[in-house]
Interface confidence: low
């Protein structure tokens, strides 16, 4: 072979990833690697992953002479040690008037009466704890319930006998039941008065209410 084909260890440089070649003999060389690389030609990126130094379930991702932690959604920061404030990130995290409370590694909702669930989206079934009298129908409302009474029953819980059942109001008067005590209330037509709307009145007076 001619002199122009002589092997020169550092021409071209066999060192990769920014490594610097140094000729150490006629046919030998040494690569001075940049931080983060190793190997005879600096071909290997040193795995800098720090094992369990990534906190709170973070996954380590190797870089060049550094590493990063890929954090689960509720954590942030270089090592997944800083709590994400979900209440700031998600202003509507809690529904139906619930109040967001940031916690380490998550958040919680403080729900207003009548709502439950992680995000206060579940209307509490108030009928599950209601005491409507058997035979009546419970209707769930937000933070309350109401009882639909069967014929002959009255009161908030349908626990009272309906005084209107005996038709105590006369002369076409309207009969209503007081939901607190079950007594009847007669709304008298024009020209009548009295508890049962049996008394005549002057033409000038109309629609008297009488409670019994």
């Amino acid at each position: 072979a001619g002199s122009d084909s002589l092997y020169v260890p550092c021409a071209p440089s066999p060192c990769v990833n920014g490594g610097t070649c140094r000729q150490t003999g006629d046919f030998t060389f040494e690569c001075n690697c940049l931080p983060g690389f190793e190997g005879s030609t600096c071909e290997r990126n040193i795995d800098d992953c720090p094992n369990h130094r990534c906190q709170n379930g973070g996954v380590c991702v190797d870089g060049v002479n550094t590493y990063n932690c890929r954090c689960p959604p509720q954590w942030t920061g270089q090592f997944c040690t800083e709590d994400v404030d979900e209440c700031l990130l998600q202003p509507n995290a809690c529904q139906n008037g619930g109040t967001c409370a940031n916690r380490n590694g998550g958040y919680g909702c403080v729900c207003v009466n009548g709502w439950s669930g992680d995000d206060c989206s579940e209307n509490i079934d108030d009928c599950a704890f209601a005491s409507c009298t058997p035979g009546s129908t419970c209707i769930d409302r937000v933070a309350s319930f109401s009882c639909m009474c069967p014929e002959g029953k009255a009161g908030l819980l349908c626990h009272l006998d309906d005084a209107c059942i005996s038709n105590p109001c006369h002369k076409g008067a309207l009969c209503d039941t007081n939901p607190l005590n079950g007594q009847y209330i007669c709304t008298c037509p024009q020209g009548y008065k009295g508890a049962d709307c049996t008394e005549d009145v002057d033409e000038g007076n109309s629609h008297h209410h009488h409670h019994h």
């Epitope: 931080p35 720090p50 094992n51 920061g77 270089q78």
Partner: antibody, heavy 117, light 112 residues
Framework: EVQLVQSGAEVKKPGASVKVSCKAS????????IHWVRQAPGQGPEWTGY????????KFNEKFKGRATSTVDTSITTAYMELSRLRSDDTVVYYC??????????WGQGTLVTVSS | DIVMTQSPDSLAVSLGERATINCRSS???????????LHWYQQKPGQPPKLLIY???NRFSGVPDRFSGSGSGTDFTLTISSLQAEDVAVYYC?????????FGGGTKVEIK
């Protein structure tokens, strides 16, 4: 070049506290955990605890919980470890070491703490 | 804590000969991420430990290729294929799979 330079030797009385510093250079300080490792004369090293420079979060060997604290001053890329209620068996060399590869990759030169009455 | 037991305590080897150091852990060092965090350090008098091998068999930057590591699970070996004068030191294994990180008791390597 990564360098960790520690404060000088200390002589303390039993019951006192000692604070060792570790000045880091040659890399991004907040990117790596700083560990504290201690070594008694003629013994193997013993991991004491670590600090996460970015957040100031710490974790300690149960053996030193309640006595050891660690802090950082990121403005001067320096970590500190303080050990309180010193006893004679705390006569050891304290090393700071930089984390990496799940191990301790670069070490300070060590700080000898002597506890003697 | 994980107990790391090294053997032998000391070792005298002729220059150019092979030196073998063993390290056994009290339980498996395979981490849940699949890696085994077993490392080897060299310490000379008055100096801090120096990382030689990380995660069983990976040579750290600038470490001569006469140093090699092997093993799995609970049993690990550091081998110096051809002992040099500058290799006289104490060698430690370290596990960082389980909290807290723990070192072995050390093996002193001398020249015969």
């Amino acid at each position: 070049e990564v360098q960790l330079v520690q404060s000088g030797a200390e002589v303390k009385k039993p019951g006192a506290s000692v604070k060792v510093s570790c000045k880091a250079s040659g890399y991004t300080f907040s990117n790596y955990v700083i560990h504290w490792v201690r070594q008694a004369p003629g013994q193997g090293p013993e991991w004491t605890g670590y600090i996460i420079p970015g957040s100031g979060g710490t974790k300690f060997n149960e053996k030193f919980k309640g006595r050891a604290t660690s802090t950082v001053d990121t403005s001067i890329t320096t970590a500190y470890m303080e050990l309180s209620r010193l006893r004679s068996d705390d006569t050891v060399v304290y090393y700071c070491a930089r984390d990496g590869a799940g191990s301790f990759t670069y070490w300070g030169q060590g700080t000898l703490v002597t506890v003697s009455s | 804590d994980i107990v790391m037991t090294q053997s032998p305590d000391s070792l005298a080897v002729s220059l150019g000969e092979r030196a073998t150091i063993n390290c056994r852990s009290s339980q498996s060092l395979v981490h849940s991420d699949g890696n085994t965090y077993l490392h080897w350090y060299q310490q000379k008098p008055g100096q801090p430990p120096k990382l030689l091998i990380y995660r069983i068999s990976n040579r750290f930057s600038g470490v001569p290729d006469r140093f090699s590591g092997s093993g799995s699970g609970t049993d690990f070996t550091l081998t110096i294929s051809s002992l040099q004068a500058e290799d006289v030191a104490v060698y430690y294994c370290l596990q960082s799979t389980h909290f807290p990180d723990t070192f072995g008791g050390g093996t002193k390597v001398e020249i015969k």
